[in-house]
């Protein structure tokens, strides 16, 4: 008789999850010499230990502490790029501008990017059928708690000018309920961070509006100013040209507004 299994509303653990995490860890540590000391088997054991045999709606930041410790990595604090709802462009940017880092350019972020995982209370099984959905089931699920933990710590590490890439095509360009709006904004340290500079990425070819005047951007400016951090905003009207100019800044067409 098959054992009764909790049915959650979200997709189950990504197939071949253990192999994927281990392979990503090995690849990352091979590419990044400063992380060569990391024992990837220990990293996987710590990752697994955070959620295996635990109720997937009762995960805490403390559960991830052993993994956080093994993944400790010094990121240049003045080279941090945050993003909200525009991950692909942010990653394309840091692939070109190699001295800047998104969270997914760190070992911990790279390990978990685009993956889903959860376990079951009192069994050592990984649940490949379903995992809790943040809205429909519970917020303290393994994936959400992981991203909240690493996002908070990533924001805490930032200093000087912090950049954030925002999606100008969305109805809420700045969303208070996003990870950026609910976690990262509130964990920037005013003693270290002088300015948050928002880059609003336009979607339409003919879109010449100043999206820095959008009410949600004004809301972000208000939140940031109240935290004694300066705020600035730039429109990126042509993201394709923007990336091209990052690659080839000497190009004559790159002196005009992008």
């Amino acid at each position: 008789v098959p054992r009764w299994r909790q049915q959650w509303s979200g997709p189950g653990t990504t197939k071949r999850f253990p192999e994927t995490v281990l392979a990503r860890c090995v690849k990352y540590t091979e590419i990044h010499p400063e992380m060569r000391h990391v024992d990837c088997q220990s990293v996987w054991d710590a990752f697994k230990g955070a959620f295996i045999s635990k109720h997937p709606c009762n995960i805490t930041e403390e559960d991830y502490q052993p993994l956080m410790k093994l993944g400790t990595q010094t990121v240049p604090c003045n080279k941090i790029l945050l993003w909200s709802r525009i991950k692909d462009l942010a990653h394309q940017f840091t692939q070109v501008q190699r001295d800047m880092f998104t969270l997914e350019d760190t070992l911990l972020g790279y390990l978990a990017d685009d993956l889903t995982w959860c376990g079951e209370f009192n069994t050592s099984k990984i649940n490949y059928q379903s995992c809790p959905d943040w809205r429909k089931d519970c917020s303290n699920n393994p994936v959400s708690v992981f991203w909240k933990t690493v996002s908070r710590r990533f924001a805490e590490a930032a200093c000087d000018v912090v950049h954030v890439m925002l999606n100008g095509s969305r109805s809420k360009i700045f969303d208070k309920n996003s990870t950026f709006g609910s976690v990262e904004v509130h964990n920037l340290q005013p003693e270290k961070v002088q300015t948050l500079e928002a880059w609003v990425i336009h979607g339409g070819r003919e879109d010449s509006r100043d999206l820095c005047q959008d009410p949600t951007i004004k809301e972000l400016e208000s939140i940031i100013s109240k935290r004694n951090i300066q705020f600035s905003c730039k429109n990126i009207y042509r993201p394709d040209k923007f990336l091209q100019c990052v690659k080839n800044p000497e190009d004559s067409s790159c002196t005009s507004e992008i």
Partner: nanobody, 116 residues
């Protein structure tokens, strides 16, 4: 930059007690792990005890039941209460603070000598 300052070391007789303190100053953010390490002459630095921001602790087998680590998050200070000290505990004791994306910070060390 975070600076760590240890205090409380000294000379103590076998069986005696000491309490070490370590305060973090500078640009303080939410330090995740704080802990104590020690290095005896001619030996490698080893973990004595550590404590997470949430209060979970971890001890070296050799000090379990004798040493207690505690932490005051508001003061960014970590303490090490050392009881039933023996000559093998003689070492320089170093404070460590770590943040996941800012790296690891070390104090200058404080000497603990256990001798009659």
């Amino acid at each position: 930059q975070v600076k760590l300052q240890e205090s409380g070391g000294g000379l103590v007789q076998p069986g005696g007690s000491l309490r070490l303190s370590c305060g973090a100053t500078g640009i303080i953010f939410s330090i995740n792990d704080m802990g104590w390490y020690r290095q005896a002459p001619g030996k490698q630095r080893e973990l004595v005890a550590e404590i997470t921001r949430g209060g979970s602790t971890n001890y070296a087998d050799s000090v379990k039941g004798r040493f207690t680590i505690s932490r005051d998050n508001a003061k960014n200070t970590v303490y090490l209460q050392m009881n039933s000290l023996n000559p093998e505990d003689t070492a320089v004791y170093y404070c460590n603070a770590a943040h996941t994306f800012s790296g690891s910070f070390w104090g200058q060390g404080t000497q603990v000598t256990v001798s009659s």
